[in-house]
Amino acid sequence: LRPSRVHNSEENTMRALTLKDILNGTFSYKTFFPNWISGQEYLHQSADNNIVLYNIETGQSYTILSNRTMKSVNASNYGLSPDRQFVYLESDYSKLWRYSYTATYYIYDLSNGEFVRGNELPRPIQYLCWSPVGSKLAYVYQNNIYLKQRPGDPPFQITFNGRENKIFNGIPDWVYEEEMLPTKYALWWSPNGKFLAYAEFNDKDIPVIAYSYYGDEQYPRTINIPYPKAGAKNPVVRIFIIDTTYPAYVGPQEVPVPAMIASSDYYFSWLTWVTDERVCLQWLKRVQNVSVLSICDFREDWQTWDCPKTQEHIEESRTGWAGGFFVSRPVFSYDAISYYKIFSDKDGYKHIHYIKDTVENAIQITSGKWEAINIFRVTQDSLFYSSNEFEEYPGRRNIYRISIGSYPPSKKCVTCHLRKERCQYYTASFSDYAKYYALVCYGPGIPISTLHDGRTDQEIKILEENKELENALKNIQLPKEEIKKLEVDEITLWYKMILPPQFDRSKKYPLLIQVYGGPCSQSVRSVFAVNWISYLASKEGMVIALVDGRGTAFQGDKLLYAVYRKLGVYEVEDQITAVRKFIEMGFIDEKRIAIWGWSYGGYVSSLALASGTGLFKCGIAVAPVSSWEYYASVYTERFMGLPTKDDNLEHYKNSTVMARAEYFRNVDYLLIHGTADDNVHFQNSAQIAKALVNAQVDFQAMWYSDQNHGLSGLSTNHLYTHMTHFLKQCFSLSD
């Protein structure tokens, strides 16, 4: 017998989460990332929208731009010129794809307290940035790049061939933005602003995806996007560099592509400036298991860029694709030729290596059965990076410092013991020369952002501790969370289980599996979240589980590359295996098990429902991929190869959701998609629906008119309300 809690007054005032809480964002948290402008100064937008400069060493702050000035042009963002004389103010934000947007820009002169008049910027601008030194401006307007030596000067037009949906200069096309860079820009200033490098993407031969945008007009608009699906013609990329001091003198100079890359279809993957006269470009074969890093030098005599073969470094994977999700980027050291880079070691774990001459002679800096995840900063005596080494939990992130000035190099975990219960998942932001840094902790407790001394690692102050959130949660019955692992046939399956507040192991609970499962993803992370599944556990008494199976990241190449050329098999198997193990735990009602996922997760949930195991009563797929022939070339081919007879067409055909239409007969299926999804096209769900109708299989569906892959705004509320009703009905839970 356990004592009754009825008379516990504190318990009585506690309430469960409601769906309204989630939809209103009642329990959202804040993070604080300083906008560093020097070793000890940063800018931050205050709660009342003033732009304030903070000086860590004096402890003082002052307003450089008032909310009045911001409001005068309805600015939602700003950027200070490195010479500290001007600020650009961004307004009329208009979202395009995941990162891209257009906006109107105004230049404010801080020295005079007024806007720069004359030679104003055109509108809308696709991208704008200051040079790293001084106050030169580069911007992209109507797919062409322009340069201003000073904000008030007339612009110099660098490119002239830009054309909507055909030629993109300084900005990526759809597929480069989403799957390769992934940024809204494709231009890069050299460290002192002498040169400007940019990419030109030629999409003239790419097939176009067209879909209706209904709007309010009598006739719907048609949206056309050059979008290469698997096996289709790809963009043709070229890289140019122009001298910004004398831009008209020789004009843009093309950077040569390494011969071994140029021999067949290829991608440009990133550009890293080393010095003003040395640049590093990364290239990738279309079959993405060979990457070449090429270091190029400016030849003053010829005014050209020279990329000697001796400065080409090849990275190749024999067991999968090159890199993790993307090929990693180099972080150069002070000698301007050697660099640090993360790639697989001989044991198949991603680790930091130091490359001085050749990749073959690389010195391994970190090692172990865990992975280095990001290199934040290299100074003359330290290297800061994140990894999931600590206590062998792959879903954690701690920040480490390796001293590179001494031998042997010593390693220190900066974050492991700071707030151990609260904080196990960190990122960091460093000031110039790593004089100071901010740590942002995402959980598992309430997120907190702190400021630290770059030499001693001592905490200086709390930047944001989410006190209001902490207080708001005091009377909420939050679910319990566990992160554990299952060992199955030499595979480790990490899972996160979200349990109702009064969870009792002797009772039976409905189980909802939330799945993503895409290559190089990770769902089981030690982060804080109060979201829809928190509500389902807190109020509706469900158990929710997330499982990282084969294909997921940060646990070594064996797990990661297991899905290579075989998407849709092991990811599904591992979800099913985990469910069977959960049933064995004794507290799951095996007649009430559901699965849901979004995007890649919608694909996996659909395949799991159609697996014929009889495990799942019902499930939901939001914006699922249904055939890999319908998805983007860059992403799909990385993991699946080409949909050709002599490559991998057979598995492309075998791995569709449509091929399993018959198997949906014994499950309740809810299929959801936005009609204006530029990413996973509505076509995917249209084809599932057609196959189900042709097989005379009943199912439920919901479309969201004019909504993209994110189903944002009012659609979000409708979506989660609709899915809640569906699950409650499936689990026979009263409303």
């Epitope: 070793g39 400069l53 004096t58 002052y62 200070l80 801080l110």
Partner: nanobody
Framework: QVQLQESGGGLVQAGGSLRLSCAVS????????MGWYRQAPGKRRELVAT???????NYADSVKGRFTISRDDGKNTVYLQMNSLKPDDTAVYYC?????????WGQGTQVTVSS
């Protein structure tokens, strides 16, 4: 309240030199980025030079190689050494933090370069 006091201006012939000083009081000085600005008759104020606490400097193209900004943290003072002066350098010179606090400027010091 911070106080900025510029001095050292005057009338000088083209090709000559001047050294401007700016005394800063009322706040910790050593860690701040300081700048010299100038405003010529009928023109907008412009940034001439900046110096970070680390000592690293930046200059407007028009004064590069002729002007030198420096600081003495012990004396809470920032200097501008101006050589090879030209008539175009005629202006009121101000010192301030960089970027400047909104709406706050000292009196400045007049520099006139005659040809």
């Amino acid at each position: 309240q911070v106080q900025l006091q510029e001095s050292g201006g005057g009338l000088v012939q083209a090709g000559g030199s001047l050294r401007l000083s700016c005394a800063v009081s009322g706040r910790l000085f050593s860690a701040n980025t300081m700048g010299w600005y100038r405003q010529a008759p009928g023109k907008r104020r412009e940034l001439v030079a900046t110096i970070l606490s680390s000592g690293s400097t930046n200059y407007a193209d028009s004064v590069k190689g002729r002007f030198t900004i420096s600081r003495d943290d012990g004396k809470n003072t920032v200097y501008l050494q101006m050589n090879s002066l030209k008539p175009d350098d005629t202006a009121v010179y101000y010192c301030n933090f960089a970027p400047p606090p909104e709406g706050y400027w000292g009196q400045g010091t007049q520099v006139t370069v005659s040809s």
